[in-house]
Interface confidence: medium
Amino acid sequence: QQQTLPKPFIWAEPHFMVPKEKQVTICCQGNYGAVEYQLHFEGSLFAVDRPKPPERINKVQFYIPDMNSRMAGQYSCIYRVGELWSEPSNLLDLVVTEMYDTPTLSVHPGPEVISGEKVTFYCRLDTATSMFLLLKEGRSSHVQRGYGKVQAEFPLGPVTTAHRGTYRCFGSYNNHAWSFPSEPVKLLVTGDIENTSLAPEDPTFPADTWGTYLLTTETGLQKDHALWDHTAQNLLR
């Protein structure tokens, strides 16, 4: 006999990175027939929703109108069908951005390189922070951590055309409070046509330094539930 229901999916719309004072919606998708959803924040009950009618609704939304550093942190949700509770969702790390200062992002040897060249990004911020984050924009948002007193370096190693794209960096004041984003740097990697066509949409990075975040769209969610399990992976676990 089943003692718990499958865990729900949790994600943030429009994104898990929320500029301060902007709004964000935390979505929790369970099952049709769920009579109660609970959103927990840092181990405490944060909000409750009881969908009506439960048999026609399988997703609830918790709206945060004014993001700030105290609302940034780890969220999870659970739901109940009858007397049976679900497993808790994965953790959603909600991050507040646009705090304090703006870092500078540069790339060596330059923004235009040939496939196979070693490329390193440098993120610099002169205020008190020792952790930096490098993000590549796109369908999958890859986040890499780096450390340094005022600057962190992010070696990509020998690049392929899959590394092409727009990068930004952030200074991190704590796990869930980030600086303003740097100005974007567009990396152009030239390579032969055959390599380009075979290149994956996003490069693969060492598992210990990269976490995958999927940007949230309603369509994407309906298309592939399995993907959404990654949305709430703990960035800084």
Partner: nanobody
């Protein structure tokens, strides 16, 4: 709608006792950790005591250890705080809340509070 309604506060002499109650509705109480938080005039909020969903874990602020006891009745959706050997420094408004770390009324659910005054 979620509701938390405290009762049991009042005026009591030093050394006296009070039992605070909190009636909860609008969510499944039995799986939710709860706290009693107090706020004295001109001071910040202080968590007095915490209890988990099945009562297997409790914790207390050092200032009330050995004098206060938190308990709950999940069948009746009630949370309690038994306060003995009351001191003048226990004077405050006492709130029951679902918040266990962020003592700010924007987080989680809070009752309206019940006033406890310890004075001779």
């Amino acid at each position: 709608d979620v509701q938390l309604v405290e009762s049991g506060g009042g005026l009591v002499q030093p050394g006296g006792s009070l039992r605070l109650s909190c009636a909860i509705s609008g969510f499944t109480f039995s799986i939710v950790s709860m706290s009693w938080v107090r706020q004295a005039p001109g001071k910040g909020p202080e968590r007095v005591s915490w209890i988990n969903g099945d009562s297997s874990n409790t914790s207390y602020a050092d200032s009330v250890k050995g004098r206060f006891t938190i308990s709950r009745d999940n069948a009746r959706n009630m949370l309690y705080l038994q306060m003995n050997s009351l001191k003048s420094e226990d004077t405050a408004r006492y709130y029951c809340t679902t918040q266990n770390s962020h003592y700010d009324i924007r987080f989680g659910y809070w009752g309206q509070g019940t006033q406890v005054t310890v004075s001779s």
